[in-house]
C-alpha cells in the first residue's frame, strides 16, 4: 500500500506565439482544480476506461480576475498535494490522465459553472520511494508543471511497496536475508513469503515466491554450497583450496537507468548518471518530446525534438486523442442486433450476423425485396416474405431512410442525455456530473454533491477542448 | 426528405388553451433528439419555450412557461404538440417546432405557424 | 434567468463590408463551446449559420465564421453580400439541459 502524489507547480500559457486568453474576467472570476486518473502499466485503454490505480481532485484554487489588457498569467494554483492512495503493490510503470477545470463564479443561478480548460496524458516509469519527479506537458497552447512520486505507507517498503518492516528482534542486528529497513533502521524488513523449501539460513525473497541465494550458497533452494574451483571472480573470499564464489545479485545487474543513463553502485543501493534531458531515480522522466514516448497505441510522434517544442501524436486509425489514448471502441455500444458478433476494424465497424438477419447492424431479417427501393445506399435484400434492405453504414429502419440509433444502448451514464448526432453520439451530462460518457461526478468521493453542473466532455480528441 | 410541419388553430381566444401539432416525417423517435418549440412575437426575437428528449420524454421548459406549457409525443402518429394555458394577447406569435440532435443547436425547423390571440 | 446579449442591435454595412456581431452569455455555455448563430429573414424559420461556436454547417457560405468559448463569442462576415440582410440570433444551451437564445442583430445593406 502506498500513496501517489501530485504537486502541481504552475499552469499558464506555454512559450511560443498564440498565447491563450486568460480563462477569468472582471466580471466572471473563476478558480482552477485538477483532476488525476491513474492507470497501472502503460495503459493503451480508452481515455474514459475506469482509473484502475485511483483518482483524485484538487481543492479549488485561489480566486482569480484578470487584470484588463494583460496576458494570460500563470494561475492561481490550489494548495497541497493530490494524493491518490494505493492498496496493493505499486505497478512500476503507470498512465496519467491530468485535467484542468475552470470554476467560474458569476451570477449564475444554481451555484458555479465548470470547462475543462486542458487534459494533458502520459505513461511514465516510476519506482515508489524514489525522489520526485519533475514532469512539463502542453495542452494546446497551456503548459503545465508539475512534479509526482510514489510513496510507500508504513509498514510496507521497496520500489513496490511490496516489502514490510518491522520492529528488530534484536538490539543489534537483522535476521539473515533482511536488512534494516531505510529510513527506520531501529526496524528490518519482515521477511517474505519466499519459494517454499527457500533456505531461510542461507536464502532470502524480495518478491513472494522467490529464492535468492546470500554469498557463498546456490541451487533452487540456496541449500547448495557455492563449487570453489578456479577462482575468477572478483565478489566473495577465495583460495586455492576452497575456489571462487559466484557473484551475487548486484543492484546494477540488469541496468536499472533507463535512457541511456549508467549505473554506479552505492552502499545502500544504486545510482542513475542520466544523459542530457532525462532526470528521475533511474532516468524515466525527460520534459514532453518524442524521446519520451508520449503517443499511445503504436501513434507516431512528430516534433518535439527537445523539451521547449511541442510534439503531435499522429494515431492509428481506432485511436484518437492527443495522446492516442482513446480506443474507439465502438463495439461497448453493443451495436450489432439480434445476436450478431461485433468486428471494431479500426478503419470501419463490422457486425458479423447470425443466419437469417442481415444489414450493417444485422438489424433485418432476410425478406423478400418486393420491388421496393432502398434508401442513402442500402441494397434490398431477398428473403422469404416483404422486402428488406441492408442499409449503408449510419441508416436503418425498414428503408434505411433513419438514421441508425447510436444512443440506444444508453451510453451516457448518471442520467445523462445522449443524442445522436451526425457526428456520432453526444452526451450531455447531468448537473454533477463530467466526462465523455458523463462517468466522472465533479466533487471527491463522500463529498455533497455540487449545485450546479459541469460540461461534458465530447467525444473526440481532448485537445479540441484546450 | 426529413420535414416539421407545424398545425393549429390561427385565432385562440384569450383565457383559452392553445393546442399545436408538429407532425415529422422522415425520421423516427427511435433515436434520441431534443424536440423543441421556439415562438416569435411579432417584429421581436425568437425564445425558446420547452423541449422534449425522446430518450425517456423527459421534458423542461423555459423558467417563464413552466405550469403553462406542456409538451407531449404521439409517436404513433409521428408527432408532438405543444398546450399554452391561458393565452393572453401577448402569446401571438410565430410558432416553431425544432429538432436538436446534439452540441446544443437545432438543425432542423419547421416552417412556422402564426397564432393569434384575440376576442 | 440566462441572458444572452447580441450586439449591436442593428447596423448598416456596405457590400464587401467586414462585419463583426458580438454574443455574451450571462452563464458559460455547456461544454465551453455549444453555442450557435442563426440567419433569418422575414417569413422564413431560422437557418443555421455555425454551431459549436466555430463550426460552419454545411451548405453555409465560407465567409461566415465564428469563435469564442465560454461566455463571450463573436459572429463575422467577411465580406458581406447583399444576400445577407437579415437579422441574426445567437443561441446557447446551457447546463440542465435549458436553451436560450439572444436578442438578435438586423443586419441592413447601405
Known amino acids: 500500500a502506498g500513496v501517489f502524489e501530485l504537486q502541481i507547480h504552475s499552469f499558464g500559457p506555454g512559450p511560443g506565439p498564440g498565447a491563450p486568453r486568460s480563462p477569468c474576467s472582471a466580471r466572471l472570476p473563476c478558480r482552477l482544480f485538477f483532476r488525476v486518473c491513474l492507470k497501472p502499466g502503460l495503459s493503451e485503454e480508452a481515455a474514459e476506461s475506469p482509473c484502475a490505480l485511483g483518482a483524485a481532485l484538487s481543492a479549488r484554487g485561489p480566486v482569480y480576475t484578470e487584470q484588463p489588457g494583460a496576458p494570460a498569467p500563470d494561475l492561481p494554483l490550489p494548495d497541497g498535494l493530490l494524493q491518490v492512495p494505493f492498496r496493493d503493490a505499486w505497478p512500476g510503470t503507470f498512465s496519467f490522465i491530468i485535467e484542468t477545470w475552470r470554476e467560474e463564479l458569476g451570477d449564475q443561478i444554481g451555484g458555479p459553472a465548470w470547462s475543462l480548460l486542458a487534459r494533458v496524458a502520459g505513461r511514465r516509469r516510476l519506482a515508489a520511494g524514489g525522489p520526485w519527479a519533475r514532469d512539463i506537458q502542453r495542452a494546446g497552447a497551456w503548459e503545465l508543471r508539475f512534479s509526482y512520486r510514489a510513496r510507500c505507507e508504513p509498514p510496507a517498503v521497496g520500489t513496490a511497496c511490496t516489502r514490510l518492516c518491522r520492529p528488530r528482534s534484536a538490539p543489534s542486528r537483522c535476521g539473515p536475508g533482511l536488512r534494516p529497513c531505510a529510513p527506520l533502521e531501529d526496524e528490518c524488513e519482515a521477511p517474505l513469503v519466499c519459494r517454499a523449501g527457500c533456505s531461510p539460513e542461507h536464502g532470502f525473497c524480495e518478491q513472494p515466491g522467490e529464492c535468492r541465494c546470500l554469498e557463498g550458497w546456490t541451487g533452487p533452494l540456496c541449500t547448495v554450497p557455492v563449487s570453489t574451483s578456479s577462482c575468477l571472480s572478483p565478489r566473495g573470499p577465495s583460495s586455492a583450496t576452497t575456489g571462487c564464489l559466484v557473484p551475487g545479485p548486484g543492484p546494477c545487474d540488469g541496468n536499472p537507468c533507463a535512457n541511456g543513463g549508467s549505473c554506479s553502485e552505492t552502499p545502500r543501493s544504486f545510482e542513475c548518471t542520466c544523459p542530457r534531458g532525462f532526470y528521475g531515480l533511474r532516468c524515466e522522466v525527460s520534459g514532453v518530446t518524442c524521446a519520451d514516448g508520449p503517443c499511445f497505441n503504436g501513434g507516431l510522434c512528430v516534433g518535439g525534438a527537445d523539451p521547449d517544442s511541442a510534439y503531435i501524436c499522429h494515431c492509428p486509425p481506432g485511436f484518437q486523442g492527443s495522446n492516442c489514448e482513446k480506443r474507439v471502441d465502438r463495439c461497448s455500444l453493443q451495436p450489432c442486433r439480434n445476436g450478431g458478433l461485433c468486428l471494431d476494424l479500426g478503419h470501419a465497424l463490422r457486425c458479423r450476423c447470425r443466419a437469417g438477419f442481415a444489414g450493417p447492424r444485422c438489424e433485418h431479417d432476410l425478406d423478400d425485396c418486393a420491388g421496393r427501393a432502398c434508401a442513402n445506399g442500402g441494397t434490398c435484400v431477398e428473403g422469404g416474405g416483404a422486402h428488406r434492405c441492408s442499409c449503408a453504414l449510419g441508416f436503418g429502419g425498414r428503408d434505411c431512410r433513419e438514421r441508425a440509433d447510436p444512443c440506444a444502448a444508453r451510453p451516457c451514464a448518471h442520467g445523462g442525455r445522449c443524442y445522436a448526432h451526425f457526428s456520432g453520439l453526444v452526451c450531455a451530462c447531468a448537473p454533477g456530473y463530467m466526462g465523455a460518457r458523463c462517468e466522472f461526478p465533479v466533487h471527491p468521493d463522500g463529498a455533497s454533491a455540487l449545485p450546479a453542473a459541469p460540461p461534458g466532455l465530447r467525444p473526440g480528441d481532448p485537445q479540441r477542448y484546450l | 426528405q426529413v420535414t416539421l410541419r407545424e398545425s393549429g388553430p390561427a385565432l385562440v381566444k384569450p383565457t383559452q388553451t392553445l393546442t399545436l401539432t408538429c407532425t415529422f416525417s422522415?425520421?423516427?423517435?427511435?433515436?434520441?433528439?431534443?424536440m423543441g418549440w421556439v415562438r416569435q412575437a411579432p417584429g421581436q426575437g425568437l425564445e425558446w419555450m420547452g423541449t422534449?428528449?425522446?430518450?425517456?420524454?423527459?421534458?423542461d421548459y423555459a423558467s417563464w412557461a413552466k405550469g403553462r406549457v406542456t409538451i407531449s409525443v404521439d409517436r404513433s402518429k409521428n408527432q408532438f404538440s405543444l398546450k399554452l394555458s391561458s393565452v393572453t394577447a401577448a402569446d401571438t406569435a410565430v410558432y416553431y417546432c425544432?429538432?436538436?440532435?446534439?452540441?446544443?443547436?437545432?438543425?432542423?425547423w419547421g416552417q412556422g405557424t402564426l397564432v393569434t390571440v384575440s376576442s | 434567468d440566462i441572458q444572452l446579449t447580441q450586439s449591436p442591435s442593428f447596423l448598416s454595412a456596405s457590400v464587401g463590408d467586414r462585419v463583426t456581431i458580438t454574443c455574451q452569455s450571462t452563464?458559460?455555455?455547456?461544454?465551453?463551446?455549444?453555442l450557435s448563430w442563426y440567419q433569418q429573414k422575414p417569413g422564413q424559420p431560422p437557418k443555421l449559420l455555425i454551431y459549436?461556436?466555430?463550426n460552419l454547417e454545411i451548405g453555409v457560405p465560407s465567409r461566415f465564421s465564428g469563435s469564442g468559448s465560454g461566455t463571450d463569442f463573436t459572429l463575422t462576415i467577411n465580406s458581406l453580400e447583399a444576400e445577407d440582410a437579415a437579422t441574426y440570433y445567437c443561441?446557447?444551451?446551457?447546463?440542465?439541459?435549458?436553451?436560450?437564445f439572444g436578442g438578435g442583430t438586423k443586419v441592413e445593406i447601405k
Open positions: 459549436q461556436a466555430s
Open positions: 452563464e458559460s455555455v455547456y461544454g465551453s463551446d455549444w
Open positions: 425544432a429538432r436538436h440532435t446534439g452540441y446544443g443547436y437545432f438543425g432542423l
Open positions: 443561441q446557447g444551451y446551457y447546463s440542465g439541459y435549458i436553451y436560450a
Open positions: 422534449i428528449y425522446t430518450g425517456d420524454y423527459s421534458t
Open positions: 422522415g425520421f423516427s423517435l427511435s433515436s434520441s433528439y431534443d
